[in-house]
């Protein structure tokens, strides 16, 4: 029995609903009595979700998925996953069983946008050029993990003395600190982007220090 | 066509190391976790070690536990084993298998591990 | 000592009908879900049967069944090519491991 789901992982946004697509052909004649069908996780075979003896089994996940009832006896298997949270990142297997059998596995991307960036600077007065100064970048809660990237206000990327740490809260969600020190010229912009890998997001913050007074956009 | 090529089987020492590599075409590797499985000369079917579909999740056979390791690199759709402190009794062909379910449907054409001195 | 037993052999003249035992021997296997393995002289492995039923490909002389603790391995109009090894296999969720049986080796005499 040919099973098949996408190739490319489905990407949720964390708290949205995600559907996992699987597909199967039936025969003339099929009856969902016939039908056996099995959502696990891939890696620890653990049940999600199953369909057995004409009658959906229910869900053993959380109480967050569901089938799609109404289009079973056309050989749509998806399986429906709400509230979607990091935990629920990873490869999920449909296996589907009629007179004959077959399965395919699906993986799931979780994603969540960075928040715009906050920019501080220390020290954050009597600056003077020649003097070296911290800026940090942070944002918060995305996930994936992010790519972080400084640059000037000529758009010259400064890669030297850039610390980034990233930090998963209780959710998995994670926090950005990208700290940059750098010594001062007469004046200028520093910019940082915080790039969610997974949604293509770009998050920017700047600074602009001109002698005085300084200003964050 | 779904299919697993194993490479890196050789003639190695008792106490030496060994890699073994697997390439896999046809399916999309990253979403299926995978097994090592060996055959020793004559023997039966022996399960090695497994590895879930991210990588996180590794399970052992107790008697390679804290010789061999399993890992997977999916964006260059290949298994490998990575095998030290070889015994004499490591002597087996190994095959690379893609799981789906509670079976195990695709199988290598296996390569062979010889530990001899 | 495997936790599934297979005979060691089994035989058969040409058109007859072979079945292959495989018995758990510890109680936490699910033989729901027991997979059979073909693996012809100087070959790899190929799936049979899982749970009794039979991938695209396979020919229907092969069947599986079931029961109790025990699952069989039917070959029904032995031919010559089916000369082969013969092993179960099952995943055990409380090791975390799979579980091959010793293996059959089907002679057609």
């Known amino acids: 029995l040919e099973v098949q789901v996408p190739e490319d992982p489905v990407v949720a946004l964390v708290g949205t609903d995600a559907t996992l697509c699987c597909s199967f052909s039936p025969e003339p004649g099929f009856s969902l009595a016939q039908l056996n069908l099995i959502w696990q996780l891939t890696d620890t075979k653990q049940l999600v979700h199953s369909f057995a003896e004409g009658q959906d089994q229910g869900s053993a996940y959380a109480n967050r998925t569901a089938l799609f009832p109404d289009l079973l006896a056309q050989g749509n298997a998806s399986l429906r996953l709400q509230r979607v949270r990091v935990a629920d990142e990873g490869s999920f297997t449909c296996f589907v069983s009629i007179r004959d059998f077959g399965s395919a596995a699906v993986s799931l991307q979780v994603a969540a946008p960075y928040s715009k960036p906050s920019m501080t600077l220390e020290p954050n007065k009597d600056l003077r050029p020649g003097d070296t100064v911290t800026i940090t970048c942070s944002s918060y809660r995305g996930y994936p993990e992010a790519e972080v990237f400084w640059q000037d206000g000529q758009g010259v990327p400064l890669t030297g003395n850039v610390t980034t740490s990233q930090m998963a809260n209780e959710q998995g969600l994670f926090d950005v600190h990208s700290v940059l020190r750098v010594v001062l010229g007469a004046n200028g912009t520093y910019s940082c982007l915080v790039r969610n890998p997974v949604l293509q997001q770009d998050a920017h913050g700047s600074v602009t220090i001109t002698g005085q007074p300084m200003t964050f956009p | 066509e779904v299919q697993l090529l194993e490479s890196g089987g050789g003639l190695v020492q008792p106490g030496g190391s060994l890699r073994l590599s697997c390439a896999a075409s046809?399916?999309?590797?990253?979403?299926?976790?995978m097994s090592w499985v060996r055959q020793a000369p004559g023997k039966g079917l022996e399960w090695v070690a497994y590895?879930?579909?991210?990588?996180?999740?590794?399970y052992y056979a107790d008697s390679v536990k804290g010789r061999f390791t399993i890992s997977r690199d999916n964006s260059k759709n290949t298994l490998y084993l990575q095998m030290n402190s070889l015994r004499a009794e490591d002597t087996a062909v190994y095959y690379c298998?893609?799981?789906?379910?509670?079976?195990?449907?695709?199988w290598g054409q296996g390569t062979t591990v010889t530990v001899s001195s | 000592q495997s936790v599934l037993t297979q005979p060691p052999s089994a035989s058969g003249t040409p058109g007859q009908r072979v079945t292959i035992s495989c018995s758990a021997t510890?109680?936490?296997?699910?033989?729901?879900?027991v997979s059979w393995y073909q693996q012809l002289p100087g070959t790899a492995p190929k799936l049979l049967i899982f749970n009794s039923q039979r991938p695209s490909g396979v020919p229907d002389r092969f069947s599986g069944s079931k029961s109790g603790t025990s699952a069989s391995l039917a070959i029904s109009g032995l031919q010559s090519e089916d000369e082969a090894d013969y092993y179960c296999a099952t995943w055990d969720d409380s090791l975390n491991s799979w579980v091959f049986g010793g293996g059959t080796k089907l002679t057609v005499l």
């Open positions: 590895i879930g579909s991210s990588g996180g999740t590794t």
């Open positions: 298998v893609k799981e789906s379910y509670y079976y195990m449907d695709v």
């Open positions: 046809g399916f999309t590797f990253r979403s299926y976790a």
């Open positions: 510890i109680s936490n296997i699910d033989i729901n879900r």
